[in-house]
């Protein structure tokens, strides 16, 4: 009926997310009633995608409202008998249209899950489900495909026209004369044996029968329908009626008799009592998020989705939160780029997963003979003579600090430095003044001080 933001949930949003036109798809999945959601069971009872999908165009500044949904039914064919109790999963998917949509084209907006009890043949049940900020209004019902009847669609009912206790417009069933069929809404005159209808005033024919009222057998030999050629004198023989007469299995299904009834073995992609319902195949594009659709290997799985990195689920509908596994060590920030994971490391750490501690002496040597010294949560290198820098990889310039006093000239040397002193000075750093009378040298006064009477220093 409708899908949109729920009431009183903050700023209303549009399903189109203000990113231009979009389409909404609904994936309906039926699971057995005993199924636990946690055990990611398959849609064992059946699944289908909505087909009638209008384009919603959102105009900027327009207040968000629930989008009305078209009347297109989502038919979910179920196999075998109807269980009555089941889990109903409805996923609402948004396909963003337009070139400048930005972000992923497909998004799972909402997923509602709930257990239900429902007998086949009952009226439409209405429901409203809220999940997050979204609200979905929908109705659902279970119907048996003719000739199945009953709350579990487990009985086969063939209409009889004999008088019965059934009310007007209702006909009794074979082999259950006490069970009455639903009111006939088929086109008047539609063959009760070879025709059926889903909508009023229509008449659909079982395979092997044709005509507006399904009364004309399709000829496969000179003998009609299930009659077989007999001796020339007798023309055609009519064998006793059998459940597979006229082959009730559509779409190439093969019919086999089972205890007075029939069973159809359906080809891939078809389900239902008579293989009349087409199931989801790769042609329906069931794989989301760029998943590759290939054939399934079991008769009950027509397709398999091969998901791209970062997605999982039977339809690649679930984004794998690979960062939730916290692959980045030492407080690194995890970035899921889709095709790969990237870790942005904190200062002092490196490596694809920030596993290398740059502030740790373990496994990290100081170059050129330097030694690693830890302290205060950090590490530094004490470098050998002639080297410097964080890892002692830089060759030091020993003359950079002008170590030679009194105009001495500095020369870098492999073992350090050598000072060539100016006349009148001596010492490793030219720090001593030479006395002119040959007495011991005295430390020279710093430059800028006048040395009036050297002898007062003796």
């Amino acid at each position: 009926h409708s899908f949109g933001p729920g009431p009183g949930l903050g700023t209303p949003r549009s399903p189109c997310n203000a990113r231009g036109p979009c389409r909404l798809f609904f994936r309906v999945c039926l699971k057995p009633g005993v199924s636990q959601e946690a055990t990611e069971s398959l849609c064992a009872l059946g699944a289908a995608l909505s087909t009638s999908v209008p384009v919603y165009t959102e105009h900027p500044g327009e207040s968000a409202a629930a989008l009305p949904l078209p009347d297109g039914l989502v038919r979910v064919p179920f196999r075998d008998a109807w269980p009555g109790t089941f889990s109903l999963v409805i996923e609402t998917w948004r396909e963003q249209l337009g070139e400048h949509a930005g972000g992923p084209a497909w998004n799972l907006l909402a997923r509602v899950v709930g257990r239900r009890r429902l007998a086949a043949g009952g009226p439409w049940a209405r429901d409203v489900q809220r999940t997050g900020t979204w609200e979905l209004h929908f109705s659902y019902r279970a119907r048996c495909e003719p000739p199945a009847v009953g709350a579990a669609c487990a009985r086969l009912c063939r209409s009889r026209s004999a008088p019965s206790r059934c009310g007007p417009g209702l006909r009794p069933c074979t082999p259950f004369p006490d069970e009455c069929e639903a009111p006939s809404v088929c086109r008047p005159g539609c063959s009760p044996e070879h025709g059926y209808c889903e909508e009023p005033d229509e008449c659909r024919c079982l395979e092997g029968w044709t005509g507006p009222l399904c009364t004309v057998p399709v000829s496969t030999s000179s003998c009609l329908n299930s009659r077989v050629p007999g001796p020339a004198s007798t023309g055609c023989l009519l064998p006793g009626p059998g459940p597979c007469d006229g082959n009730p299995c559509a779409n190439g299904g093969s019919c086999s008799e089972t205890s007075g009834s029939f069973e159809c073995a359906c080809p891939r992609g078809f389900y239902g009592l008579r293989c009349e319902v087409s199931g989801v195949t790769c042609a329906d594009g069931p794989c989301f998020n760029g998943g590759l659709c290939v054939g399934g290997e079991d008769p009950d799985s027509a397709y398999v989705c091969h998901c791209p990195p970062g997605f999982q689920g039977s339809n690649c509908e679930k984004r794998v939160d690979r960062c939730s596994l916290q692959p980045c060590q030492n407080g690194g920030l995890c970035l899921d780029l889709g095709h790969a994971l990237r870790c942005r490391c904190r200062a002092g750490f490196a490596g694809p997963r920030c596993e290398h501690d740059l502030d740790d002496c373990a496994g990290r040597a100081c170059a050129n003979g330097g030694t690693c010294v830890e302290g205060g949560g950090s590490r530094r290198c004490s470098c050998a003579l002639g080297f410097g820098g964080r890892d002692c990889r830089e060759r030091a310039d020993p003359c950079a600090s002008r170590p030679c006093a009194h105009g001495g000239r500095c020369y870098a040397h492999f073992s350090g430095l050598v000072c060539a002193c100016a006349p009148g000075y001596m010492g490793v750093r030219c720090e001593f003044a030479v006395r002119p009378d040959g007495a011991d040298a005295v430390p020279a006064a710093p430059r800028g001080l006048r040395q009036a009477d050297p002898q007062r220093f003796l």
């Epitope: 398959l42 590759l292 054939g295 290997e297 079991d298």
Partner: antibody, heavy 115, light 107 residues
């Protein structure tokens, strides 16, 4: 009757390429995956990959991604596997198959890589 | 990749004996498992799919069971024609992977 007819044995030199064919019959070709499987002498089976003729979808075993290229020709209902940069390690019997619930296999194509 | 560990690697049994071969998956494969029989010089033949469903035309003495990670193939009464190699295959997840095989011989 469903059948897969594979091409005959091949003797090739290291570094060369070879293309093995698999002609399918007896069913709707586009309905089912065609798988390729390798069996080295005295060894187990290894899944190389599959191709889905309906849409051309291909899934490779990463181990064989740079070794094998899978293709189909729907008009002739044939599948092909090209193997490149061959070495003696690639000497094996290669099968095409439908690995589904009915399970039909080709007779196998023997490849010998030798100088 | 899912690793399939098959055991035993070889088995000798008497005619009429009950024989069981097992396969263990490295993770849950949700019963997406097939069993194959291969006779010398021949192509493999599918016996079982979806862990326990018998392929048409396969004798009913073959049966499969198991769930989750553990699966087995049982021959209820061994016959001479059952001699050969047996393989399991998981098809729950790409890449599909086979077990290492079991050689079955008559005592």
């Amino acid at each position: 009757e469903v059948q897969f007819q594979q091409s005959g044995p091949e003797l090739v030199k290291p570094g060369a390429s070879v293309k093995i064919s698999c002609k399918a019959s007896g069913y709707t070709f586009t309905d089912y995956n065609i798988h390729w499987v390798r069996q080295s002498q005295g060894k187990s089976l290894e899944w190389i990959g599959l191709i889905y003729p309906f849409n051309g979808g291909i899934v490779y075993n990463q181990k064989f991604k740079s070794k094998a290229t899978l293709t189909v020709d729907n008009s002739s209902t044939s599948a092909y596997m090209e193997l490149r940069s061959l070495s003696s390690e690639d000497s094996a019997v290669y099968f095409c198959a439908r690995l589904n619930w009915e399970g039909y296999w080709g007779q196998g194509s023997t490849l010998i890589v030798s100088s | 990749d899912i690793k399939m560990t098959q055991s035993p690697s070889s088995i000798y049994a008497f005619l009429g004996e009950r024989v069981t071969i097992t396969c263990k998956a490295s993770q849950d494969i949700n019963s997406y498992l097939s069993w194959f029989q291969q006779k010398p010089g021949k192509s493999p033949k599918t016996l079982i799919y979806r862990a326990n469903r018998l392929v048409g035309g396969v004798p009913s003495r073959f049966s499969g069971s198991g769930s989750g990670q553990d699966y087995s193939l049982t021959i209820s009464s061994l016959e001479y024609e059952d001699v050969g190699d047996y393989y399991c295959l998981q098809y729950a997840e790409f890449p599909y992977t086979f077990g290492g095989g079991t050689k079955l011989e008559i005592k």
